[in-house]
């Protein structure tokens, strides 16, 4: 995701209200949650904490030599976490899903 | 990676010469290869071919409503391929790695 060029790739808070994105029509609770986001740049040299793939390292080195040829690697979620939600099923019955996968960022990295 | 806003997230060619990135000091062959890159935007609605995670969908919806609050999801490699390389060991002996992982983009997606 986008981020200030001055900061390196990291996880930051992103409060999401389900009403804002139109999901309140089927998600009863929670009303909002922290999805987090991955923000910041993938600068040379890529640190171990951004768990770069070999391709990300190669792309970073190419960008360093030819900035107009290719962009930097991108700071993205590399591991996601589930949240628990109470939602309305097809018949409008409130149903609990303990593990609604991939909703929140657990880790960010350069890809 | 970066990309023209007019095109959607896709895999494009990126020829990498190992001499350009300083890896010719240990990689004997190949001299160059296609690393590919992921280029283009992650626009609403995210298509199935960019295999969006739930988090990417949420982030896209938040960006749609509050463009300054959070950026769009990013077009990145979601699957990488290996290449075979011939490299010099510490003693300068040419050695083959049949399956040098994560060097080339196989698939791109919005994350």
């Amino acid at each position: 995701s986008t981020g200030a060029a001055s900061s390196h790739c990291q996880k930051t808070s992103l409060r999401v209200n389900f009403e804002d994105i139109g999901w309140d029509s089927w998600i009863i609770a929670p009303k909002e949650y922290d999805a987090y986001e991955c923000k910041g740049g993938c600068f040379f040299p890529l640190a171990d904490d951004v768990t770069p793939t070999k391709h990300a390292i190669v792309q970073t080195l190419v960008h360093l030599k030819f900035p107009t040829k290719v962009g930097k690697a991108c700071c993205v979620p590399t591991k996601l976490s589930p949240i628990s939600i109470l939602y309305k099923d097809d018949m409008g019955v409130p149903t609990l899903k303990y593990h609604y996968e991939g909703m929140s960022v657990a880790e960010c990295g350069c890809r | 990676s970066t990309g023209a806003a007019s095109s959607h997230c896709q895999k494009t060619s990126l020829r990498v010469n190992f001499e350009d990135i300083g890896w010719d000091s240990w990689i004997i062959a190949p001299k160059e290869y296609d690393a590919y890159e992921c280029k283009g935007g992650c626009f609403f609605p995210l298509a199935d071919d960019v295999t969006p995670t739930k988090h990417a969908i949420v982030q896209t919806l938040v960006h749609l409503k509050f463009p300054t609050k959070v950026g769009k999801a990013c077009c990145v490699p979601t699957k990488l391929s290996p290449i075979s390389i011939l490299y010099k060991d510490d003693m300068g002996v040419p050695t083959l790695k049949y399956h040098y992982e994560g060097m080339s983009v196989a698939e791109c997606g919005c994350r």
Epitope: - | D34, S81, I83, D90, V93, T95, Y98, H99
Partner: antibody
């Protein structure tokens, strides 16, 4: 000079076991990814499996016909590669080569027969 | 049936040019990674060509090329000592290791 010397081949009954060794010299063995490749009598080359260097996790991968029966290991202090072969079948009869991909040993013959 | 298809045999007279082909018939194999081995009678295989790299001791009479889904090994100025088997090898991504072609037996006539 790079040298790879296999040993441990011989005659074994179906269902039996055998351990092959490969003594390496002339290169940085500990950093090398090492493979075993076999060649049945009068046939072509067939990859058996590979072990990565310990610094890269020491992961092993195997060809489908030997998976679950063969195990590759290495002892970097002895510059030696091993291939433990269990539940041997007649179709495992072959000359077994250890290789870095660039350099190959002379091979050792394994015959599985009752 | 190998996923790398080679002709079972090839032949030529001394001094001639001979080409051995290797065709990829599996999407798990990228032609980019295909390389060549030589196995002379009664000896272990030897790396002949890897991309544009020819190991020391390998004659410059041997050269490799790739086009589409096919790789080729060319031998110019054929000599009797070139007689043996030639194998192409590629990286099988699914298998996570090399896969070999069936091999081509090269015979030097006369």
């Amino acid at each position: 000079e790079v040298q790879l010397v296999e040993s441990g081949g011989g005659l074994v009954k179906p269902g039996g076991s055998l351990r092959l060794s490969c003594a390496a010299s002339g290169f940085t063995f500990s950093n090398a990814w090492m493979s075993w490749v076999r060649q049945a009598p009068g046939k072509g080359l067939e990859w058996v499996g590979r072990i990565k260097s310990k610094t890269e996790g020491g992961d092993t991968d195997y060809a489908a016909p030997v998976k679950g029966r063969f195990t590759i290991s290495r002892d970097d202090s002895k510059n030696t590669l091993y291939l433990q072969m269990n539940s041997l079948k007649t179709e495992d009869t072959a000359v077994y080569y250890c290789t870095t991909g660039t350099y190959w040993g002379q091979g050792t013959l394994v015959t599985v027969s009752s | 049936q190998s996923v790398l298809t080679q002709p079972p045999s090839a032949s030529g007279t001394p001094g001639q040019r001979v080409t051995i082909s290797c065709s990829v018939t599996n999407t798990d194999i990228d032609i980019f990674n295909v390389h060549w081995y030589q196995q002379l009678p009664g000896t272990a295989p030897k790396l002949l060509f890897f991309h544009d790299y020819r190991p020391s001791g390998v004659s410059d009479r041997f050269s490799g090329s790739k086009s589409g889904t096919s790789a080729s090994l060319a031998i110019v100025g054929l000599q009797s000592e070139d007689e043996g088997y030639y194998y192409c090898a590629g990286l099988d991504e699914a298998m996570r290791g090399p896969v070999f072609g069936g091999g081509t037996k090269l015979t030097v006539l006369g």
